[in-house]
Amino acid sequence: MAPWPELGDAQPNPSKYLEGATSQQPITPDKSKETNKTDNTEVPVTKFELLPTYSTATLIEEPTEVDDPWNLPTLQDSGIKWSERDAKGKILCVFQGIGRLILLLGFLYFFVCSLDVLSSAFQLVGGKMAGQFFSNSSIMSNPLLGLVIGVLVTVFVQSSSTSTSIVVSMVASSLLTVRAAIPIIMGANIGTSITNTIVALMQVGDRSEFRRAFAGATVHDFFNWLSVLVLLPVEVATHYLEVVTQLIVESFHFKNGEDAPDLLKVITKPFTKLIVQLDKKVISQIAMNDETAKNKSLVKIWCKTFTNMTQMNVTVPSMANCTSPSLCWTDGIQIWTMKNVTYKENIAKCQHIFVNFHLPDLAVGIILLIISLLVLCGCLIMIVKILGSVLKGQVATVIKKTINTDFPFPFAWLTGYLAILVGAGMTFIVQSSSVFTSALTPLIGIGVITIERAYPLTLGSNIGTTTTAILAALASPGNTLRSSLQIALCHFFFNISGILLWYPIPFTRLPIRMAKGLGNISAKYRWFAIFYLIIFFFLIPLTVFGLSLAGWPVLVGVGVPVVFIIILVLCLRLLQSRCPRVLPKKLQNWNFLPLCMHSLKPWDAVISKFTGPFQMPCCCCCRVCCRVCCLLCGCPKCCRCSKCCQDLEEGQEAQGVPVKAPETFDNITISREAQGEVRAPDSKTECTAL
């Protein structure tokens, strides 16, 4: 390692620079000038090795105001300028650019494919159970149950279009009324937002990146939850969605048109259907109480079949079941009749991996779940890496300015609405809000898109997915056209209502603030992100489902006190932050409660205790993977995944000490200090522990 140059005005006490020194001056990093987004991790170094030097000028100054951690990092270009390159360098640069673009598109393709396979995996693991949720008769009378069923089914099958199509077929066959279907659609809207939240978890390795990515993903969740919180009671009271959509459906004489265009699927289907193909009808049949479907496999075996209508002799319980007396007879014991039976002749098998394995659905589902998550994770890491290397300097500036800059005054307010339209358009092109929002998540993480801009894009995505549903409804057969169109319109107007609630007035953009709050918590306590997922998408819906099954008295008996406590806490929190003097001294903060009830620190200690034994092997694995990855990328730099690094990071962050690591290849400490900048850690750091 290159020795650190002495500075004339260096800090006099050298012990401050030594490994294991008791304290360091608290230095506030200038987040706005962050060049990288990596963890604030300290690099483990051998005894007496010097840590980076800090300018005394910076130390003596009053602590500078801490910049907003949500400010986007500066993606600086460390490469040679185009004008300074020779012809060979320029050609090489062009080829590198083309290569990166091809790689980016390739990884993006596999990223989208893995999302599709992930959805199939979830359907194999939980599809049948999800179908059975629908066969619950209480949905009709209990909108809350409908809502949680919508959430759970969509979470289990990882596809709102699957749960929506089940609802449509149930409405079409009069098993469900439109009124009962609306809460399920609302729930499906919530459930679909889990996908990009899972994608955000993949960026957990870097605190600042994770903060942004997780907030960017959960802004979708909060929008949906808040919309339901307001609009479900309104719908139950007024039935406005049902009435409005019924008027629209009745006022038009629709003719079922062409099939909704499959745009992205055209490219991804050829690949995903080589992995697995599912018979989606099975889940619908289970939902519609078809007993025979419960024993059917979701894995499609025969892709080419010939359906023939034939008259078949079948036994019936009594003469009353005969199609007509003359078409009834007996064999002496049983009564027989002739019925038209559709006979399915299998012609050609499907061409996917699992076609000849005859594994149970659960086994196939688990295999695909693991593979798709690994591919998803790998693709995401590579997309982030490639984008990180591409989005530097001029390119980054142009992109960030284009995406995040508002229109000139007085049209600044229009920018967000344009973003909504862009989000809707992009979602319409990719035919899936999950795919669009999941692709958006890493861009938010690396700082290309602000959360403020991601929010309208996400809202647009919600609209886009409903326009796709409307088109699909218009293409559906006559018997399901009305119901599918009305449900698609309910979905559309629900999202429009949500946007009107939580977007036009900046003050009402609660989802952004809530997502940022969650992002901050999750960046500090990364385990909380998983807890959030489990609680909001599984525990709460399952609890409500269980209580609903127990009946209204139980649901109200448990629900009312819980809601009362939540409202009380929110009111108290509001008063504490806005006008604490109104409250008695004891209630001005939460210290009157046990620590575990108002802080995540004790919980963090407990979780660390449990996860501790797994960290060492995990870190070793991570270190090896990182080394391999870095070698493949041609950047053999530090992996900050070792236990000691993590311990040091946690410990120092607790003391309020910024963790720094030197740049491996460019000794730029002095030049940076000259600019009055204190760098956040860089991923390109030397790791002495390796």
Epitope: P325, S326, C328, W329, T330, D331, G332, I333, W336
Partner: antibody
Framework: QVQLVQSGAEVVKPGASVKVSCKTS????????MHWVRQAPGQGLEWIGA????????AYNQKFKGRVTLTADKSTSTAYMELSSLRSEATAVYYC????????????WGQGTLVTVSS | DIQLTQSPSFLSASVGDRVTITCKAS??????VAWYQQKPGKAPKLLIY???TRHSGVPSRFSGSGSGTEFTLTISSLQPEDFATYYC?????????FGQGTKLEIK
Amino acid sequence: QVQLVQSGAEVVKPGASVKVSCKTSGYTFTTNNMHWVRQAPGQGLEWIGAIYPGSGATAYNQKFKGRVTLTADKSTSTAYMELSSLRSEATAVYYCARGMYGHGAMDYWGQGTLVTVSS
Amino acid sequence: DIQLTQSPSFLSASVGDRVTITCKASQDVGTAVAWYQQKPGKAPKLLIYWATTRHSGVPSRFSGSGSGTEFTLTISSLQPEDFATYYCQQYSSNPLTFGQGTKLEIK
């Protein structure tokens, strides 16, 4: 080829019981119904009842119910008809006949067993 | 119970004649009718089922027709071995019932 071989002629006293057997071969015993038909001397054919050996399900003509019991032994592919509380008018030739699958026509018949009820 | 009435009860014919036997049902039986041939001291033999379908091994001179309540068995050209008693049977509903029989004799 399908064969139905019935037990030999029986002479029984009034009030007694008799069990006629019908041993089958040449087909899967459990897939077809086994019908029993009687023919009194110089008279027409009369359906007694049927048994489905696969499940043991039976159906009887009300006229004979309570006095006829049909059984089947899958292990030996043999069907049995037990006649109880016999009266002189029960004297007849009793046939076992295989029912065609899915309907009540009888395609293969046993040679018949003459049961004579006399004191 | 469904009653089947065969006519005639006795029929005299010569070899090579065309013979028709009729069977009437007391109610609609669709096409659930079978025809049997029985020779003295022998078990009945299935000729026709589903009113018109010839059983395997049955000569083509035997044919069946009809549906609902009226059925006929036709022997297009009588052969010496065809002289026997013929029975119709319905299997539209339990109990299965037979006609009283038609005895075909040599003239």
